[in-house]
Interface confidence: low
């Protein structure tokens, strides 16, 4: 007859560290001792007639048990293998590149260290939560990769790898590890350089707006923008708007840089830069200034009239040119009556880069002179009619302007002068028309003919 | 007197184009920025963008690029607004207007140039 | 963009009442120069935008001194200390500052 030497559980799955109950019995009458036979740590924890438990504790890995019993002389034997499950100690995602260009492939990479059964152990790519990539485990520790092509929706979009140790058909389930995520930053940058509208020339302490654009731009929002007059870091406000960057800074020119610059405008996104460069010229315009040696001058002293203007400076004054560009024109004449009031005319002429710039400038002459009564709008005779209404023109000039009064001879008779009055029989007569300023006085005598109304 | 004398209305089918002027006078030409703004029922005043007549260079608000485009003409101090690929949204009344310095105040505006766009 | 929100819509008044508008902008109106673009327009009915106020609070010429403007960074107001007949219309508040330059909606002054 065959005895047998039964081990139970038979074919048992723990998970790694963990401890197992073992119980070896046999049917034989006869039986020795039971022996177990394992690397495991082992210990015996009851026995009796044809059977005997063991305690096996720290199970780190698969392992084959063997019980074995003398029956009889004969030794007969039985078995069971032990598997070990275990979760991978690490899952990790390799660091992304800082920044993918649209269009291009990277790589994903996952490490996994530990886990399992190998043989149930699977490694899983996903973006978001769709699957990229599925593989086995294989080497310790296991590298799984996938190649990916980057597209604009990827901007943002995590990343991450994930293990599934599959224990179901033992009974036991399925154990998911996932790794940190990591964000992936995708982007566009065109390889025209952005558009760059800037002044061609800029007056010393002066402002102009500069504006800097670049189209085609993802994401704009990530951009960072320099703009600059040579080396001078203009401060810009810049705006996306869908996939345009545009940033606006206002260039004031300082007097230390005068002369040829340029205006840069960079845009770095991804580690990458597109630049754009405008040539500009700086200038300083002073002037033109208009001078007169005399603002009020009096009737016959001499006047000069000089006009200035900076370096390069071309002025004309009053139709006369200065002798060269950056000297003053300058003009003298002999104050009369006629130049009160008049205004000299400066012009002045810079060339920036073969444009002409033009500015001018005016100052206006007092001349001071003596009253005097215009005899061609002052009749010295009138004959008028009784009781008709006139007026009687006379005009003083004169600087300061005269007071104009006209008296009747031996009365202090007073006509007036300039606004229509009724005129009668009582205003015949001489009258001594008086033009008088702070200057002097200036006497016209005038005849009133006074014709007696008739009745008939 | 400084004035902004603006083009007569018009009346345009969808999909056509139309230019309107703005002639400035009482003041030089080049001194000053030109600016347009549109007036429409539905959305209030909206700046279209600005024009340098010195140097021609203009700044667009990014909502207008591509359907405003602006010139100048220095030898008759006249300013244009071209707008492209019209339809019944762009139905407005464009104004131009001036300013003096870098950014600061519209401190004149043209009388107003009405744009009806109908079939 | 800037975002320029006038309040209120609509403003009834008599006749040589007070009257204030506010302005409040989603974005500081500081330059990056220091000043504060912050302007005030009024449009008569039928008549083209006119310019009241620049720079916050400086009146333009011709504008009567009965119109004032205040405010910082965000937040601006518009004053009318007798509002007469000639005062009448809609009124807009406009930045300079940030491109592109906004208006706000409006604020129409009207009879009670």
């Known amino acids: 007859q065959e005895f047998l030497l039964r081990v139970e559980p038979q074919n048992p799955v723990l998970s790694a560290g963990g401890s197992l109950f073992v119980n070896c019995s046999t049917d034989c009458p006869s039986s020795e001792k039971i022996a177990l036979e394992t690397s495991l740590s082992k210990e015996l924890v009851a026995s009796g007639m044809g059977w005997a438990a063991f305690n096996l504790s720290n199970v780190t890995g698969n392992s084959r048990i063997l019980c074995s019993v003398y029956c009889n002389g004969s030794q007969i034997t039985g078995s069971s293998n032990i598997t070990v499950y275990g979760l991978p100690e690490r899952v990790e995602l390799a660091p992304l590149p800082p920044w993918q260009p649209v269009g291009q492939n990277f790589t994903l990479r996952c490490q996994v260290e530990g886990g399992s059964p190998r043989t149930s152990l699977t490694v899983v790519l996903l973006r978001w939560e769709e699957e990229l990539s599925r593989q086995p485990a294989v080497e310790e520790p296991a590298e799984v990769t996938a190649t990916v092509l980057a597209s604009r929706d990827d901007h943002g979009a995590p990343f991450s790898c994930r293990t599934e140790l599959d224990m179901q058909p033992q009974g036991l389930g399925l154990f998911v590890n996932t790794s940190a995520p990591r964000q992936l930053r995708t982007f566009v940058l065109p390889v025209t350089p952005p558009r760059l509208v800037a002044p061609r020339f800029l007056e010393v302490e002066t402002s102009w707006p500069v504006d800097c654009t670049l189209d085609g731009l993802f994401p704009a929002s990530e951009a960072q923008v320099y703009l600059a007059l040579g080396d001078q870091m203009l401060n810009a406000t810049v705006m996306n708007h869908g996939d345009t960057l545009t940033a606006t800074a206002t260039a004031t020119a300082r007097a230390d840089q005068e002369g040829a610059r340029e205006i840069v405008c960079n845009v770095t996104l991804g580690g990458e830069r597109r630049e754009a460069r405008e040539n500009l010229t700086v200038f300083s315009f002073l002037g033109p200034i208009v001078n007169l040696s005399e603002p009020t001058a009096h009737e016959g002293s001499t006047v000069t009239v000089s006009c200035m203007a900076g370096a390069r400076v071309q002025v004309t004054l009053d139709g006369v040119p200065a002798a060269a560009p950056g000297q003053t024109a300058q003009l003298q004449l002999n104050a009369t009556e006629s130049d009160d009031g008049r205004s000299f005319f400066c012009s002045a002429t810079l060339e920036v880069d073969g444009e002409f710039l033009h500015r001018n400038s005016s100052v206006q002459l007092r001349v001071l002179y003596g009253p005097k009564i215009d005899r061609a709008t002052c009749p010295q005779h009138l004959k008028w009619k009784d009781k008709t209404r006139h007026v009687l023109q006379c005009q003083a000039r004169g600087n300061p302007y005269p007071e104009l009064r006209c008296l009747k001879e031996g009365s202090s008779r007073e006509v007036p002068v300039g606004i229509p009055f009724f005129v009668n029989v009582t205003h015949n007569g001489t009258y001594q028309c008086q033009a008088s300023s702070s200057r002097g006085k200036y006497t016209l005598v005038v005849v009133m003919d006074i014709e007696a109304f008739s009745s008939h | 007197e400084v004035q902004l004398q603006q083009s007569g209305p018009e009346l345009v089918k969808p999909g056509a184009s139309v230019k309107i002027s703005c002639k400035a006078s009482?003041?030089?030409?080049?001194?000053?920025?030109i600016l347009w703004v549109k007036q429409s029922h539905g959305k209030g005043l909206e700046w279209i963008g600005k024009?340098?007549?010195?140097?021609?260079?203009?700044t667009y608000n990014l909502k207008f690029k591509g359907k405003a485009t602006l010139t100048v003409d220095k030898s008759s101090s006249t300013a244009h607004m071209q707008l492209n690929s019209l339809t019944s949204e762009d139905s407005a009344v464009y104004y131009c207007?001036?300013?003096?310095?870098?950014?600061?105040?519209?401190?004149?505006w043209g009388q107003g140039t009405s744009v009806t766009v109908s079939s | 963009d800037a975002v320029m929100t006038q309040t209120p819509l609509s403003l009834p008044v008599s006749l040589g009442d007070q009257a204030s508008i506010s302005c409040r902008s989603s974005?500081?109106?500081?330059?990056?120069?220091?000043?504060?673009?912050l302007h005030w327009y009024l449009q008569k009915p039928g008549q083209s935008p006119q310019l009241l106020i620049y720079?916050?609070?400086n009146r333009f010429s011709g504008v009567p001194d009965r119109f004032s403007g205040s405010g910082s960074g965000t937040d601006f107001t518009l004053k009318l200390s007798r509002v007469e007949a000639e005062d009448l219309g809609v009124y807009f508040c406009s930045q300079s500052t940030h491109v592109p330059y906004t208006f706000g909606g409006g604020t129409k002054l009207e009879i009670k």
């Open positions: 207007a001036r300013k003096e310095a870098y950014p600061d105040a519209m401190d004149y």
């Open positions: 009482g003041y030089s030409f080049t001194d000053c920025i």
């Open positions: 974005q500081s109106l500081v330059h990056s120069n220091g000043d504060t673009y």
């Open positions: 720079k916050v609070s």
């Open positions: 024009i340098n007549p010195y140097f021609g260079t203009t």
